[in-house]
Amino acid sequence: DTEIKVNPPQDFEIVDPGYLGYLYLQWQPPLSLDNFKECTVEYELKYRNIGSETWTTIITKNLHYKDGFDLNKGIEAKIHTLLPWQCTNGSEVQSSWAEATYWISPQGIPETKVQDMDCVYYNWQYLLCSWKPGIGVLLDTNYNLFYWYEGLDRALQCVDYIKVDGQNIGCRFPYLESSDYKDFYICVNGSSETKPIRSSYFTFQLQNIVKPLPPVCLTCTQESLYEIKLKWSIPLGPIPARCFVYEIEIREDDTTLVTTTVENETYTLKITNETRQLCFVVRSKVNIYCSDDGIWSEWSDKQCWEVEELLKKTLLL
């Protein structure tokens, strides 16, 4: 009874299309598949960034797979052929592994790369990234930012740098069409007459770094003798109302401070008959239904009301 064997895939390689971390893993079918003409072979692919403890595992019938990686580190991948049990009248047969690695040869020492990279997507409209120059780099060092996301034909360079003393320390991005809910890749590299500069790679999703504008039009009405209704409006811009969460800070008579989080643009507050004055501020953030993370807006302007005045208004009405 001859043992059934299958070869590993051929020409397994990791291809870098220049998308700053989005790579292609591709291969050719194994040699001598003629015996299994009526059989659909599958491939088990495992890959990871070097240093990561866990492998990502994919089983596919295709001859490629695409995914994002951290190019600050190397990438390793391995693949083998699987012959399903239907093809072998018994148990699944696996080939030996074919392996591939990829890394970008680093230039310069790590300290030369940009420090404290910070990107904020203001009001889900304007992306701004800023950084500090590497440690010990001279003023002749300049940094350049490139970015890519699925939908762009190629990586683009920043066209509107923020400069200090002629040195690029940030980038104002143009309008980024259809760029949210997908990985956004950035590379900041550098050049200097004196020494090589290390490149840095960053990946994030834009909806997770949104800093909205603060809420506006804060109002206050007395619903009943001991109930005050606080209201505000969503900030202007593209963020829909369903995507906001709010934090309110309420001060009664400069003593009691209440901080609470709400999901709508209203909050009803119980007060005592001792309450004289009421002040509140609100800030907004993108909620968990629209993003995995976010940045709180600045606080709104503080609004204060005399409770007595509110009561008079209520009685008049």
Epitope: V15, P17, Y24, Q26, P29, L63, H64, K66
Partner: nanobody, 121 residues
Framework: QVQLQESGGGLVQPGGSLRLSCEVS????????MAWYRQVPEKEREMVAQ???????KYYGSAKGRFTISRDSAKNAVYLQMNSLKPEDTAVYRC???????????????WGQGTQVTVPS
């Protein structure tokens, strides 16, 4: 199914040029990768150049700087312009495509018969 027809091979003196063509015909829904390989008897096949996903072009080994791969999507064709040819470029050059058949659901690999390129020493 799918046929790949190569042409353009032949005998050329060292330093000369050749342009290989490969036309794809048959019931193919999408062509995702196009490549040229070469094989010398008793040796493993070797990738020369490829146009892969996202029209990314990659050259291998001594092909870098001397060979140029291009494609004509309208004609379903791939070309290999070979300049400054050397005796060590002598091989059978085979065209390969990776794509999905009109009746298929996943990628398959298709090969041409090959065209002989000879550069005498």
């Amino acid at each position: 199914q799918v046929q790949l027809q190569e042409s353009g091979g032949g005998l050329v003196q060292p330093g000369g040029s050749l342009r290989l063509s490969c036309e794809v015909s048959g019931s193919i829904f999408s062509i995702n990768r196009m490549a040229w390989y070469r094989q010398v008897p008793e040796k493993e096949r070797e990738m020369v150049a490829q146009i892969t996903y996202g029209d990314t072009i990659k050259y291998y080994g001594s092909a870098k700087g001397r060979f140029t791969i291009s494609r004509d999507s309208a004609k379903n064709a791939v070309y290999l312009q070979m300049n400054s040819l050397k005796p060590e470029d002598t091989a059978v050059y085979r065209c390969n495509i990776v794509g999905v058949l009109t009746t298929g659901h996943y990628e398959d690999s298709f090969w041409g018969q090959g065209t002989q390129v000879t550069v005498p020493s």
